[in-house]
């Protein structure tokens, strides 16, 4: 039996991530919500303890008992100026227990106090469980990452958290080291290399310079800003739109917590969109006092709002270079880590600073640290796989691709995570009699209904010869090439008439963040989606059958073959069902299926009798 895999855990300030190296490649493991990163949040309620997404999701309802930022406390003394400063901004209470900070919460009606190691251990337990659910067996061995600037006390406390979580901590490694491992920068065989890791996360900014020589990593310098990250960019957007709302509607929403929270969520989404598009729109219904807030922002405006923050990221870069006694020309590799490094302006500033040097950014920046930790865990467990040295990264379609069919249903031709290039073909037909054309609407996403997915493009295939519904055969082909460019072709098989659309991944496509959000939401809504999909499928099956039976018995070719009594019986029942359908579009699956079976009970014996007698 193959030995149990060791996992790599990126224990982050705001989010954590777990990966495993198996079958020759690293898998970043999604949690039960489908999210590849899990909030480093623990919440305590009157009835239960929540960890991860469940905890973060209820933070607004239970702020005093929802703990995050444990990484800012771990291994520090209560009197540490960092602790004293951060405490002012947290909604939960931090108390002093012999100069050790403890988080005090109300749990199941009692006051409880937890050490930061305990909180972090709860997050690590969650990451361990995520890995076990994926692997299907118990996991004990792990590599855990910490910032390069963590002192021994912080490292030891992190290791203790691992032990509390039931993990055998193989090693504590530096986050920038893990990122460098992820890119295989220790295996270039080109002698000593200087690597600058630029890590801009949700709440922290770290710059590290490593020297790598023959698999040996040496931290030459660290710099950064422990309170700079994506949240600060969100704040700039929020302030901008609060002012815009004031100008447009003469109302100040800044004191309304719910309105600000909804605006912040929309701003986060807009920020992500602006990493892949030059413009983003916000549509918030009834934001404040019944006023709908529909607005937009350009990438240029966003860059202007955050220009000082973006520029400020270069100061720690310069400081790190000074401390490492290196000139920028001596840096061989630049590695991007953290979701905020997807911001084009941040990338451009860094690239320009290094005179146009290429950036290592092919691995999802949210996952690079866990990726490297997983590789290190495999090495420490004695994995001799060549792929530990030579990792293969196959490109995949990040979201399902398909088209809209009757009832607004998303019919996927290319499933999410299909390796590309790929090509899929399916036959579709018309929905009504003598339909002259079909509208092909191409969507990406994981939801059951197209309204919840992203429209990529549409085109019309016209000139279909008049025919009853269900007769024409429209062949639709989805073809993605190695560059992720999608060609969709529709051909009427009777005439050979065709039309196509080409969708490239640069205009109007979802950013990686949005893709992840959609995948995450899809997991959350999966059960509801399945019910909805089955319901619409049952409805469509009933509708198709009713119309087919109606047209079958009305066919002139059946004159004299079917008795008037039987014809009336079928038509009456079809009429009953069609009218019922019109009035009951939101009926349950069971009801649609019952009606179909009732209709089949009437029609099948009559129709089969016709063909037996023929």
């Amino acid at each position: 039996m193959a030995k149990a895999a060791a996992i790599g855990i990126d224990l982050g300030t705001t989010y954590s991530c777990v990966g495993v190296f198996q079958h020759g490649k690293v898998e970043i493991i999604a949690n039960d919500q489908g999210n590849r990163t899990t909030p480093s949040y623990v919440a305590f309620t009157d009835t239960e303890r929540l960890i991860g997404d469940a905890a973060k999701n209820q933070v607004a309802l239970n702020p005093q008992n929802t703990v995050f930022d444990a990484k800012r406390l771990i291994g520090r003394k209560f009197g540490d100026p960092v602790v004293q400063s951060d405490m002012k901004h947290w909604p939960f209470q931090v108390i002093n227990d012999g100069d050790k900070p403890k988080v005090q919460v109300s749990y199941k009606g009692e006051t409880k106090a937890f050490y930061p190691e305990e909180i972090s251990s709860m997050v690590l337990t969650k990451m361990k469980e995520i890995a076990e659910a994926y692997l299907g067996y118990p996991v004990t061995n792990a590599v855990i990452t910490v910032p390069a600037y963590f002192n021994d006390s912080q490292r030891q406390a992190t290791k203790d958290a691992g032990v509390i979580a039931g993990l055998n901590v193989l090693r504590i490694i530096n986050e920038p080291t893990a990122a460098a491992i992820a890119y295989g920068l220790d295996r270039t065989g080109k002698g000593e290399r200087n690597v600058l890791i630029f890590d801009l996360g949700g709440g922290t900014f770290d710059v590290s310079i490593l020297t790598i020589d023959d698999g040996i990593f040496e931290v030459k310098a660290t710099a950064g800003d422990t309170h700079l990250g994506g949240e600060d960019f969100d704040n700039r957007l929020v302030n901008h739109f609060v002012e815009e709302f004031k100008r447009k509607h003469k109302k100040d929403i800044s004191q309304n917590k719910r309105a600000v929270r909804r605006l912040r969520t929309a701003c986060e989404r807009a920020k992500r969109t602006l990493s892949s598009s030059t413009q983003a729109s916000l549509e918030i219904d009834s934001l404040f006092e019944g006023i709908d807030f529909y607005t937009s922002i350009t990438r240029a405006r966003f860059e202007e709002l955050c220009s000082d923050l973006f520029r400020s990221t270069l100061e720690p870069v310069e400081k790190a270079l000074r401390d490492a006694k290196l000139d920028k020309a001596q840096i061989h590799d630049l590695v991007l880590v953290g979701g905020s490094t997807r911001i084009p302006k941040v990338q451009k500033l860094l690239q320009d600073f290094f005179n146009g040097r290429d950036l290592n950014k092919s691995i999802n920046p949210d996952e690079a640290v866990a990726y490297g930790a997983a590789v290190q865990a495999a090495i420490l467990m004695g994995d001799k796989s060549e792929n530990v040295q030579d990792l293969l990264l196959l490109d995949v379609a990040p979201l399902s691709l398909g088209l809209e069919t009757a009832g607004g249903v998303m019919t996927a031709l290319i499933k999410r995570n299909s390796t590309i290039p790929t090509k899929q073909t399916q036959i579709f037909t018309t929905y009504s009699d003598n339909q002259p054309g079909v509208l092909i609407q191409v969507y990406e996403g994981e939801r059951a209904m197209t309204k919840d997915n992203n429209l990529l493009g549409r085109f019309e295939l016209s000139g279909i010869p008049p025919a009853p519904r269900g007769v024409p055969q429209i062949e639709v082909t989805f073809d993605i090439d190695a560059n992720g460019i999608l060609n969709v072709t529709a051909t009427d098989k009777s005439t050979g008439k065709a039309n196509k659309i080409t969708i490239t991944n640069d205009k109007g496509r979802l950013s990686k963040e949005e893709i992840e959000r959609m995948v995450q939401e899809a997991e959350k809504y999966k059960a509801e989606d399945e019910v909805q999909r089955e319901r619409v499928s049952a409805k469509n099956a009933l509708e198709s059958y009713a119309f087919n039976m109606k047209s079958a018995v009305e066919d002139e070719g059946l004159k004299g073959k079917i008795s008037e009594a039987d014809k009336k019986k079928v038509l009456d029942k079809c009429q009953e069902v069609i009218s019922w359908l019109d009035a009951n579009t939101l009926a349950e699956k069971d009801e649609f299926e019952h009606k179909r079976k009732e209709l089949e009970q009437v029609c099948n014996p009559i129709i089969s009798g016709l063909y037996q007698g023929a």
Partner: antibody
């Protein structure tokens, strides 16, 4: 003439299985759905579901999903109701009923008693 | 699911009297295309199987005496027995077939 004749009374223990038959005659069996109705002692009628006699596809009412199974032996023009893992609350008379515009012909009923 | 409510739960009348009983549904049973209400009435005499009296609200099943009349539309329905006979002693059930099937709780008719 049209007739639905059901099997005789059954006395069963909790946890056992019972299978009731409903033999149809006097009409084309596969042209009409067969319904099953439960009547607990002193209680009203409760629709359990039905089976499409042409396709064999069953439909179960919400309260009868799980332990209950409808089946057919078309060649013998017979419908069956099987109840698995019998419980005390399954004690009742079970009727089969043919369906046209409504349940126009009924079997005489089969009494099932579940007692330890 | 559609819920069917019958009232009264029981009533006693003398032979020859006219009797009405009510059946209400939790949603309309009218199909606008066929203009039919999908409601049926059944009679169950003591110790016997139920028997179909009326379907589609007012259509009498063949062989059913014309003293039995069904009426109503939408959600409110009535079964009327014009001149009650001794053999009419039974429990009367309404049943909807608009979507799936549901029986009402029954009205017990006793003869004084």
């Amino acid at each position: 003439q049209i007739q639905l004749v059901q099997s005789g009374p059954e006395l069963k223990k909790p946890g056992e299985t019972v299978k009731i038959s409903c033999k149809a005659s006097g009409y084309t069996f596969t042209n009409y759905g067969m319904n099953w109705v439960k009547q607990a002692p002193g209680k009203g009628l409760k629709w359990m579901g039905w089976i499409n006699t042409y396709t064999g596809e069953p439909t179960y009412a919400d309260d009868f999903k799980g332990r209950f199974a409808f089946s057919l032996e078309t060649s013998a023009t017979t419908a069956y109701l099987q109840i698995n893992n019998l419980k005390n609350e399954d004690t009742a008379t079970y009727f089969c009923a043919r369906y046209d515009h409504a349940m126009d012909y009924w079997g005489q009923g089969t009494s099932v008693t579940v007692s330890s | 699911d559609i819920v069917m409510s019958q009232s009264p739960s029981s009533l006693a009348v003398s032979a020859g009297e006219k009797v009405t009983m009510s059946c209400k549904s939790s949603q309309s049973l009218l199909n606008s295309g066929t203009r039919k209400n999908y409601l049926a009435w059944y009679q169950q005499k003591p110790g016997q199987s139920p028997k179909l009296l009326i379907y589609w609200t007012s259509t009498r099943e063949s062989g059913v005496p014309d003293r039995f009349t069904g009426s109503g539309s939408g959600t409110d329905f009535t079964l009327t027995i014009n001149s009650v006979q001794a053999e009419d002693l039974a429990v009367y059930y309404c049943k909807q077939s608009y979507t799936l099937y549901t029986f009402g709780g029954g009205t017990k008719l006793e003869i004084k």
